[in-house]
């Protein structure tokens, strides 16, 4: 006994991104302490008076919570004793972006760490053969992106080729007037080739691949968050 709170404990955060309209997680870990009642977790946001979230004595204390986070925050209560102070954020808003501080106090000491939280919209692209077109075309669609991304096409056979002259990309604002639907059409495609549609903004990069042969169509999609970790 005797030196509670006098030592610094290691707190680790990871830069992350939130997909607006969906649930997000702000990651934070700390040196575990089996005494749950002695753990205090405070989440703060730069430029915001009041707390984002406070968890102490084994439960939420939202008496000082800022209004913009009301009803939308929670910690993983059953994982606090093993050092998880991550914050769940319900229905991520564009305005949730910013610098957050995860502050921890335990019987071993206290510590804090900052994280940058980016918000935007990102979704998997889907590529289909556009049979309605006059020539063989591929249509790449992704339902939700923000900020406006760049779209590029590539092909396995014509590596390094510039497809901007033979493709057409449009951005259609979604009903909530923030995110946009991305549609890109690639014309004059050849059979027995693999084409990739790459969509990227400063938050995420998504790729859709399609291989068209005489007998089948194979698809694959992947999405990667940028600058995370």
């Amino acid at each position: 006994f005797g030196i509670s709170g006098k030592h610094f404990i290691t707190v680790t955060t990871f830069t992350s991104a939130g997909n607006i309209g969906e649930d997000g997680t702000l990651s934070c870990t700390f040196e575990p302490d089996i005494k749950l009642n002695g753990i205090v977790i405070q989440w703060l946001k730069e430029g915001i008076k009041g707390l984002v979230h406070e968890f102490k004595e084994g439960k939420d204390d939202l008496s000082q919570q800022h209004e913009m986070f009301r009803g939308r925050t929670a910690v993983f209560a059953d994982q606090v004793v093993v050092g998880n102070a991550s914050l769940r954020l319900k229905n991520v808003q564009l305005t949730d972006a910013g610098t957050y501080t995860c502050y921890i106090r335990t019987s071993k000491g206290k510590g804090n760490a900052n994280l940058e939280y980016k918000t935007g919209a990102f979704s998997m692209p889907e590529i289909n053969v556009d049979y309605n077109a006059s020539s063989e075309s591929l249509r790449c669609e992704a339902p939700r992106w923000f900020p406006q991304p760049t779209v590029a096409w590539a092909s396995q056979v014509d590596q390094g080729a510039n497809f901007s002259e033979v493709s057409n990309t449009s951005f259609e604002l979604n009903s909530e007037n923030v995110t946009m639907k991305v549609v890109s059409v690639l014309y004059n495609v050849t059979i027995n080739n693999t084409y990739s549609c790459m969509i990227e903004n400063d938050i995420a990069k998504a790729t859709g691949d399609i291989k068209v042969t005489d007998s089948e169509v194979k698809r694959r999609s992947q999405l990667q968050l940028l600058n995370s970790g």
């Epitope: 009301r70 009803g71 929670a74």
Partner: antibody
Amino acid sequence: QVQLQQSGAELMKPGASVKMSCKATGYTFSSYWIEWVKQRPGHGLEWIGEILPGTSITTYNAKFKVKATFTADTSSNTAYMQLSSLTSEDSAVYFCARYYFGSSSFYFDYWGQGTSLTVSS
Amino acid sequence: QAVVTQESALTTSPGDTVTLTCRSSTGAVTTSNYANWVQEKPDHLFTGLIGGTNNRVPGVPARFSGSLIGDKAALTITGAQTEDEAMYFCALWYNNHWVFGGGTKLE
């Protein structure tokens, strides 16, 4: 104690709009989400969406994005759902429910008694 | 959209233990699905029982418990009582929307 009191049954004509209400008493209205749920015989329960009173934050089931609009008035502790361009498919009982989002749990606890909507010419 | 599947009906006797399950078409149910269980009695009387997989709603009797069993969410009634005869719905959260199961009629 906590109560969610919904407005009475409605009989509407196809193509019309209807606005139903859900009055909350016994708790801090702005601290809980209000969920809207549709029940049709043989179709079980269908989630329409949710609103966090006191904010403009809503989430809609994609299927109901054009059909439903949620609002909430914190001065009267009342949530509203408007359904537009009504068809016979909209005939159902509609429920509001309180949803708590917090570290200790995430639950629907209290439900309204339901508003019955019949769409018929 | 995901499909959530429940047993359509189960029969039990007073004092018995009965388990209702909730399966997701997208794979294993996890704690991130915040599994909820809701009871419906005649005349559209709904009551929340369990939230966040295993947390009892305040005021709900201790005989009701929630858990994950294998890849499914489960509601267990330990020592069922006659008043537990009702419809039970599970609801799973998929990051930005809820999906309800078809319900289990417990007799």
